[in-house]
């Protein structure tokens, strides 16, 4: 946020940039939280726009019994590894096909025993305030589906009749990581010393980090004809004086007619 200055007063202004503002020769360049000619005003809203999507990663291990382990499978650039990766990915795409949050799988390691597959199941959902619940539900469905397939697709008489067969007891979920996004925490942090006065309000499921000086929200402070200004002690209404009235009161809702006051003064003279 910048304000341009023209004329002789500019040099004077340069030394007066407040709140960490820097003079660029023309104007005060204000840090994120401030604006105004001297960076003297505190912004009333801070952009904490959430990410478009939130991701989760499940670390799983399954044991594939329909493939015999060979040394080539240790080498991720070998043709054998690439083929295994393709078949395993196709199989997992079928297993998880009913999960809208499912993105894919990423094999991290193959080891002996028929083939023990250490891999990540990748999940993603559009950001909404309920993203944690959505991803928690998706991880539960992943567990259900992989447990089901590794119980059903098993070798019979040393032969597999499915794309892949599994060892029922070899399925483990090691870890689940969900990208953390906490708009309240972000809002507090970005508001710095004004953190106590900034709150998160939602509109169309999007979080807005606002102070009571931002109009149009449930916490908005109504200063009537006055101006809302943020200070370290909270939001305050700066009341205006018009040609006909003085305004006062906490929300500038008390108007005093100037003519009455002047009339009173004349009466004293």
């Amino acid at each position: 946020r910048t304000t341009t200055c023209f004329g002789d007063g500019c040099q004077n202004t340069a030394s007066r940039c407040k709140n960490g503002g820097t003079w660029d020769g023309l104007k005060c360049q204000c840090p994120n939280l401030y604006y105004g000619e001297l960076c003297e005003e505190v912004v009333s809203s801070i952009d904490i726009g959430p990410p478009e999507t939130i991701s989760a990663q499940m670390e799983l291990t399954v044991t594939v019994t329909s493939v015999k382990f060979t040394e080539e499978l240790k080498n991720h650039s070998s043709q054998e590894f690439q083929e295994f990766k393709q078949t395993f990915t196709e199989q997992m795409n079928i297993v998880y096909s009913g999960i809208p949050e499912y993105v894919g799988v990423n094999i991290t390691k193959l080891r002996l025993g028929s083939v023990v597959v250490e891999h990540d199941v990748l999940l993603r959902t559009k950001y909404t305030p309920e993203y944690k619940t959505v991803l928690d539900n998706a991880t539960e469905v992943v567990k259900e589906k992989i447990t089901k397939v590794t119980t059903q697709q098993i070798m019979i008489n040393d032969i597999c009749s499915d794309m892949m067969c599994f060892n029922t007891t070899g399925t483990q979920v090691q870890n689940i990581t969900v990208t953390q996004y906490d708009p309240e925490e972000d809002c507090r942090k970005m508001a710095k010393e004004y953190g106590d006065y900034f709150v998160v309000e939602y509109r169309d499921q999007k979080p807005y980090c606002i102070s009571p000086c931002e109009p149009g929200f449930s916490v908005s402070k109504n200063c009537n004809l006055g101006k809302c200004q943020m200070s370290l002690s909270g939001p305050q209404c700066l009341c205006v004086t018009t040609e006909t009235h003085w305004y006062s009161g906490e929300t500038c809702n008390q108007g005093t007619q100037k003519s009455l006051v002047y009339g009173h003064h004349h009466h004293h003279h």
Epitope: S66, E72, E80, M155, C165
Partner: nanobody, 123 residues
Framework: DVQLVESGGGLVQPGGSLRLSCAAS????????MAWFRQAPGKEREGVAF???????SYAESVKGRFTISRDNALSSLYLQMNSLRAEDTAVYYC?????????????????WGQGTMVTVSS
């Protein structure tokens, strides 16, 4: 690139024999799994016979004792000796391969395929 080319199909009388061949190029013949699948008109593709790099073989119940699978690693070739042929053996026979040591009869596990050769058993 792996290329599989089948040959040896044709018309044969019930009880007769045929030998199918599959020439594999670009495939490391001493590794992985090679197989014969077949598809009869209006039916799903089914696994017939399988051979692994160590010579381990397996067969579909319907052909056990009648069909023999073998591979010649030096010639990069796969064979299927079919004896005592029946009318129900009529199908297009496909050669399939995987670089992996597979123990599955499911066609989806095999990435490499030939074009197929027709076998008709009829009197």
């Amino acid at each position: 690139d792996v290329q599989l080319v089948e040959s040896g199909g044709g018309l044969v009388q019930p009880g007769g024999s045929l030998r199918l061949s599959c020439a594999a190029s670009g495939f490391p013949s001493s590794r992985g799994t090679m197989a014969w699948f077949r598809q009869a008109p209006g039916k799903e593709r089914e696994g017939v016979a399988f051979i692994n790099s160590d010579g381990r073989t397996s067969y579909a119940e319907s052909v056990k004792g009648r069909f023999t699978i073998s591979r010649d690693n030096a010639l990069s070739s796969l064979y299927l000796q079919m004896n005592s042929l029946r009318a129900e053996d009529t199908a297009v026979y496909y050669c399939a391969a995987s670089l992996l040591y597979l123990m599955t009869v499911n066609a989806a596990a095999y990435p490499y395929w030939g074009q197929g050769t027709m076998v008709t058993v009829s009197s």
